[in-house]
């Protein structure tokens, strides 16, 4: 079966999470994609997510969170901004393709927010600045509801060295409103999914 | 096991056409994007152009040698992909390599073997 | 277009020592924090083959002694324990703009 991997990233309070999650493929391009967090024993849900047929390099922005797909080199970029501690959990991108099951992305997202400035890398933002100019052209979307008779997958246990994510709900403002419960992939489903065996290995995040 | 076989090469006079072919086999050719690279005799690589799947139109892009003399197109119902070699020089004298990519941008990962194209008169 | 400049053009490396071959790019091959930069090897008759993608990443069935490093502008190939097989030319390529583009290549040979 194939291996859910995470890649960790470790930020300050007011700092900004950039990554971008690869999507490859160019039947992917326009379909619509999501950003998720996943709690242990729980669906995925979703916090932010793209138009639908996602839109080139346009970004869309849900409170802390802005998505930009550039379909011209198969990257979904996703920023949360101004960090806080709360923010601290595991994330992933997914792409929807009704009326099959969203398809995950690789790798997962561990992030870690910890207090206290830090002038450490880890962001394109300027660390001391927890305002964050949103770029003008930015729309909101509202994510689709995808309801699945099959039974939750659950999520990988965490490392030891992995922070625990806190009980509280995500800090994200306007972000309440269009949270959707979402299945996640098995790692079976997976193995039947549109990008083969053979090419799985060139699918990792970078 | 993906495979790619190019077809169609052979001696050319200077200002005619050729058009060469590359059969895949062994992956779902309708999803990627395909790609010819050539190589004159000693020399090195130089792309030649690419051709994008049809959720992206089949859009195509070329060197700025081969534009508006080659043309590449894609049958997905044959896994074949094409370059029609029109106008064609003594420069353009090469082993020509059908690739394919492994997405958007990414790298080459599976190649022919090359058909030599001879321009001469 | 985008110009790939590498370097030596020829190299001679004894037998289980290291080799470095360098690309530099006439601007930033990146988007985010993406390199779209690539080598491959290529033996006489053949094909070339994909040793690295993405700057860093090795490909499956390559062997660990082959390592790639670099973002933006300049990168490296290198070989960290050169064995006989190892003899050939060496090209970058780059994926971030249209057209695509190779490095000239650079021929490794045995000290």
């Known amino acids: 079966a194939t291996k859910l991997t995470e890649e960790k990233y470790e930020l300050k309070e007011g700092q900004t999470l950039d990554v971008a999650c690869d999507y490859t493929l160019e039947k992917f391009a326009s379909s619509q994609k999501a950003w998720q967090i996943i709690r242990d024993g729980e669906m995925p849900k979703t916090l932010a997510c793209t138009e639908r047929p996602s839109k080139n390099s346009h970004p869309v922005q849900v409170g802390r969170i802005i998505l930009e797909d550039y379909h011209d080199h198969g990257l979904l970029r996703v920023r949360m901004v101004n960090l806080q501690v709360e923010d601290s959990g595991l994330y992933q991108c997914v792409i929807y393709q009704p009326p099959k099951e969203p398809h995950m992305l690789f790798d997962r997202i561990r992030l870690v927010v910890t207090k206290g400035f830090s002038g450490t890398p880890g962001s394109n933002e300027n660390s001391t600045q927890n305002v964050y100019k949103i770029p003008p052209t930015t729309t909101k979307a509202l994510c689709p509801l995808y309801t699945s008779p099959r039974t939750v997958t659950q999520a990988p246990p965490k490392s030891t060295a992995d922070v625990s994510t806190p009980d509280s709900e995500i800090n994200l403002t306007n972000v309440t409103d269009i949270i959707r419960e979402q299945k996640l992939i098995s790692e079976e489903d997976l193995e039947q999914k549109l990008i083969s065996e053979e090419d799985l290995h060139h699918h990792h995040h970078h | 096991e993906v495979q790619l076989v190019e077809s169609g090469g052979g001696l050319v006079q200077p200002g005619g056409s050729l058009k060469l072919s590359c059969a895949a086999s062994?992956?779902?050719?309708?999803?990627?994007?395909m790609h010819w690279v050539r190589q004159a005799s000693g020399k090195g690589l130089e792309w030649v152009g690419r051709?994008?799947?049809?959720?992206?139109?089949?859009?195509?892009y070329y060197a700025a040698s081969v534009k508006g003399r080659f043309t590449i197109s894609r049958d997905d119902s044959k896994n074949t992909a094409y370059l029609q070699m029109n106008s064609l020089k003594t420069e353009d004298t090469a082993v020509y390599y059908c690739?394919?990519?492994?997405?958007?941008?990414?790298?080459?990962?599976?190649w022919g073997q090359g058909t030599l194209v001879t321009v001469s008169s | 277009d985008i110009v790939l400049t590498q370097s030596p053009d020829s190299l001679a490396v004894s037998l289980g020592e290291r080799a470095t071959i360098n690309c530099r790019a006439s601007e930033s091959v990146d988007t985010f924090d993406y390199s779209f930069l690539h080598w491959y090897q290529q033996k006489p008759g053949q094909p070339p083959k994909l040793l690295i993608y993405?700057?860093?990443n090795l490909e499956s069935g390559v062997p660990d002694r082959f390592s790639g490093s670099g973002s933006g502008t300049d990168f490296t190939l290198t070989i960290s324990s050169l064995q006989a097989e190892d003899v050939a030319v060496y090209y970058c390529q780059q994926s971030n703009e249209d057209p695509y583009t190779f490095g000239q290549g650079t021929k490794l040979e045995i000290k």
């Open positions: 051709i994008r799947t049809k959720s992206s139109n089949y859009a195509t």
């Open positions: 062994g992956f779902t050719f309708s999803t990627y994007a």
């Open positions: 690739t394919r990519d492994m997405g958007i941008r990414r790298q080459f990962a599976y």
């Open positions: 993405r700057a860093s």
